[in-house]
């Protein structure tokens, strides 16, 4: 090989050992029979050399550094050439370095031809290994602007006082152009400006200078985003740290088109703006740090650019001003993560503060809009507390458990609407009366409606789930001893059409001791399946529940149990079932941990089924399923 560098070229070539590898044989650069592991060629020198091994690319790297001095004379602006040409260089991994020194008052602009650059974070590498490393200068200190690959959005980087640009090319890469040019600009009065151009939908991840180390003290860095007019941009901070400020405050500032409050100033911990139309700037401003304990300021953020949906231009009013103790959350429904680019899905408050989830609270009117490619990716969860503190005031008071129409009009599916019903302990109980009689969901007769009511205890220490109930059954009311949560859960978008079927009234009633009482009026046409609360986990210890089963005058009810035995094993106490005729008060008592369950039996009159649990042994719980059917009384069954 022969490398000759012209005297005025300001180019230095250095061939040196690369990352040490566990290669058995050493390799040398051979210069007139002399073996060496490093070769430096300066301007005006011409050197002939060879390598002592077949694959020097496994051992050596070549660095070609060109110093460009803009202090003492005019700057050679324009497209930057790879000199010497790659075809004249040995087949090694090569790094071309351009070190430009300029006055503080001069701005330097690096312009990247298409494909533009994509910034990578620590530990990431570029496919194919072509990497740009860009540094700036503050007085004598070198500041890393970032490491970049091809195929991104970064089109220009402006700096002042100098720039060091390194282009790393692996030995096998055919590239023979630098891919960038240098232009002079007026002073930018900050560390740097990075321009990021979006042609269409996509995202860009960007980082503050020196990331993941600290951003230089009291410096200013700006990103300019060029966004097509028909698209919208949203900013989210992926990672940030704040330093310890002595004076001034670290912040980000946005220049947003159409904003009357430019610049809009945000703390790094604030929700960042979204749904922005048109070009915008984002600037990171550092502070004067505490000399003893400076900490570090750093920021990694993402800009997501996507099509606005029809919904993003619509404003929805959610009026919770007349609601009390209510919170509404719009959030992403859980999905499997995909590796493809997925446009963001945001909900925006007042069209500007956009985030992946949003919680609205009662007492106000809220204006929201959406920036989302597909609103089925979101759902709503609402919680409302209805509590009674004074039993004298609440007794016999009723509340309607209905989803407010404002919520139903939103273009997002309702997932859960939960009412937490709280009563004074041992003073009052609750009764739930549905607008339409309810069916209990069982494996044997599942609910197939678009929504169900999930009823569970709301006492933290108590694990008691009464069951899931949907309209279209035989349960006329559910009485519960103490605090419960009633959750209306939807299962299909058709809930909006069926919303008229919802409707549950809760009333505060005098206290009673049983955990729950179900009032059932069976339908003549179908079996009524009923099961004990906490199905599959077992009725809690020492819990008592009852079913008040009405039998119409002209009918006979057949009560059938699913199993011959309950399988419950009591650790302490006994588990009982009492079946009592309501008219005659005649009752039969069955020991559930000893006796077989009764065979199918007929009741001519309304009757009670009461189940009281013992303290069961682990794994030997009390679960009971039974059903009631009606037949006309004309058949003589006596």
């Amino acid at each position: 090989f022969e490398i000759a560098l012209p005297r005025e070229s300001n180019i230095t070539v250095l061939i040196k050992l690369g990352t040490p590898t566990l290669l058995a044989k050493p390799c040398y650069i051979v210069i007139s029979k002399r073996h060496t592991t490093m070769l430096s060629i300066k301007p005006g020198e011409r050197i002939l050399f060879t390598f002592s091994c077949q694959s020097p690319e496994n051992h050596f790297v070549i660095e070609i550094q060109k110093n460009i001095d803009c202090m003492s004379g005019p700057c050679p602006f324009g497209e930057v050439q790879l000199q010497p040409s790659t075809s004249l260089l040995p087949t090694l991994n090569r790094t071309f370095i351009w070190d430009v020194k300029a006055h503080k008052s001069i701005g330097l602009e690096l312009q990247f031809s298409i494909p533009r650059l994509r910034q990578i974070g620590p530990g990431e590498s570029c496919p194919g290994g072509v990497t740009y490393s860009i540094s700036g200068r503050i007085d004598a200190t070198v500041v890393r602007i970032g490491t970049f690959c091809s195929n991104g959005t970064v089109s220009r980087i402006k700096m002042q006082e100098g720039v060091k640009m390194a282009l790393h090319l692996p030995w096998f890469h055919p590239r023979n152009v630098s891919g960038f040019s240098i232009a002079n600009r007026s002073s930018i009065k900050r560390l740097c400006i990075i321009e990021s151009v979006f042609e269409g939908e996509g995202s860009a991840t960007l980082m503050s200078a020196n990331y993941p180390e600290g951003f230089p003290e009291d410096e200013l860095m700006t990103w300019q985003f060029v966004i097509p007019a028909h698209l919208r941009a949203s900013v989210s901070f992926l990672n940030f740290n704040l330093s310890n400020c002595e004076r001034k405050e670290e912040r980000v500032e946005y220049y947003i088109p159409g904003s009357t409050t430019n610049p809009e100033v945000f703390k790094l911990e604030d929700k960042q703006p979204g749904n922005m139309a048109g070009n915008f700037n984002l600037s990171l401003q550092g502070c004067d740090q505490d000399a003893q304990n400076p900490g570090i300021l750093r920021l990694q953020f993402q800009v997501l650019v996507q099509h606005p949906q029809n919904e993003s231009n619509k404003i929805y009013v959610v009026d919770l001003s007349n609601e009390r103790a209510t919170s509404l959350t719009i959030e992403p429904r859980p999905v499997k993560q995909s590796r493809k680019f997925v446009p963001g899905c945001f909900v925006c408050l007042e069209s500007r503060t956009c985030s992946t989830n949003l919680t609205l609270t009662s007492g106000s009117k809220h204006k929201i809009s959406f920036l989302c490619d597909n609103l089925t990716r979101l759902w709503m969860n609402v919680e409302k507390n209805i509590s009674c503190t004074d039993h004298r005031y609440c007794q016999r008071k009723s509340y309607s458990l209905q989803v407010p129409s404002d919520i139903l009009h939103l273009p997002v599916e309702l997932h859960d609407f939960s009412w937490k019903l709280l009563v004074p302990k041992d003073r009052l109980s609750l009764v739930l009366v549905p607008a339409q009689k309810l069916q209990q969901h069982t494996h044997e007769k599942p609910c197939n409606t678009s929504f169900s009511y999930l009823v569970a205890s709301a006492i933290p220490s108590q694990d008691l789930y009464f069951g899931s109930f949907c309209p279209g059954g035989s349960i006329e009311q559910i009485q519960v001893k103490q605090n419960i949560s009633v959750t209306l859960r939807t299962f299909a978008p058709s809930f909006r059409q069926e919303a008229s079927r919802q409707g549950l009234t809760v009333s505060f009633i005098p206290y009673f001791k049983e955990e729950g009482v179900f009032t059932v009026t069976p339908d003549t046409k179908s079996k009524v399946y009923l099961r004990t609360p906490n199905w599959d986990r077992g009725l809690p210890s020492l819990t008592s529940v009852s079913w008040n089963i009405s039998v119409p005058r002209d009918q006979v009810a057949c009560l059938t149990f699913f199993k011959e035995r309950t399988g419950v094993v009591c650790q302490t106490g006994r588990a009982f079932m009492i079946i009592q005729e309501q008219r005659t008060r005649a009752e039969e008592i069955f020991s559930l941990d000893e006796d077989a369950l009764p065979k199918p039996r007929f009741h001519h009159h309304s009757f009670w089924v009461n189940i009281s649990n013992c303290s069961p042994a682990s794994g030997k719980q009390l679960d009971l399923l039974f059903w009631v059917t009606l037949t006309p009384r004309t058949v003589d069954l006596t």
Epitope: F1, F51, Q54, S55, E57, N58, T91, L92, F172
Partner: nanobody, 115 residues
Framework: QLQLVESGGGLVQPGGSLRLSCAAS????????MVWHRQAPGKGREWVAV???????NYADSVKGRFTISRDSDKNTMYLQMNSLRPEDTAVYYC?????????WGKGTLVTVSS
């Protein structure tokens, strides 16, 4: 003098497969890195895949998951298995080897993907 000869090119329908070979003669290249480049009509040369002497591989994004580079050191030969071919894969494919700091190239083989 080290020489490289590519073979295996031809006309194939989109979605089809081809296997290119690159035979080296004049020197043992088992300890050398080898590479495939391609040049589409009217375009610049682009890197496709590379294989080191130890057998580690790297692919351009445009072919990742579709092309596989391999080598048979005993036969002094490198291969490029190309599956799920697309019209944009149409190009002259060149193989190269890094040998004593020089890159030696073959004359190329034409791959045409068309229906």
């Amino acid at each position: 003098q080290l020489q490289l000869v590519e073979s295996g090119g031809g006309l194939v329908q989109p979605g089809g497969s081809l296997r290119l070979s690159c035979a080296a003669s004049g020197s043992d290249v088992s300890a050398n890195g080898m590479v495939w480049h391609r040049q589409a009509p009217g375009k610049g040369r682009e890197w496709v895949a590379v294989i080191s002497s130890s057998g580690s591989t790297n692919y351009a994004d445009s072919v990742k998951g579709r092309f596989t580079i391999s080598r048979d050191s005993d036969k002094n030969t490198m291969y490029l298995q190309m599956n799920s071919l697309r019209p944009e894969d149409t190009a002259v494919y060149y193989c190269g080897v890094a040998h004593y700091g020089q890159t030696y190239w073959g004359k190329g083989t034409l791959v045409t993907v068309s229906s």
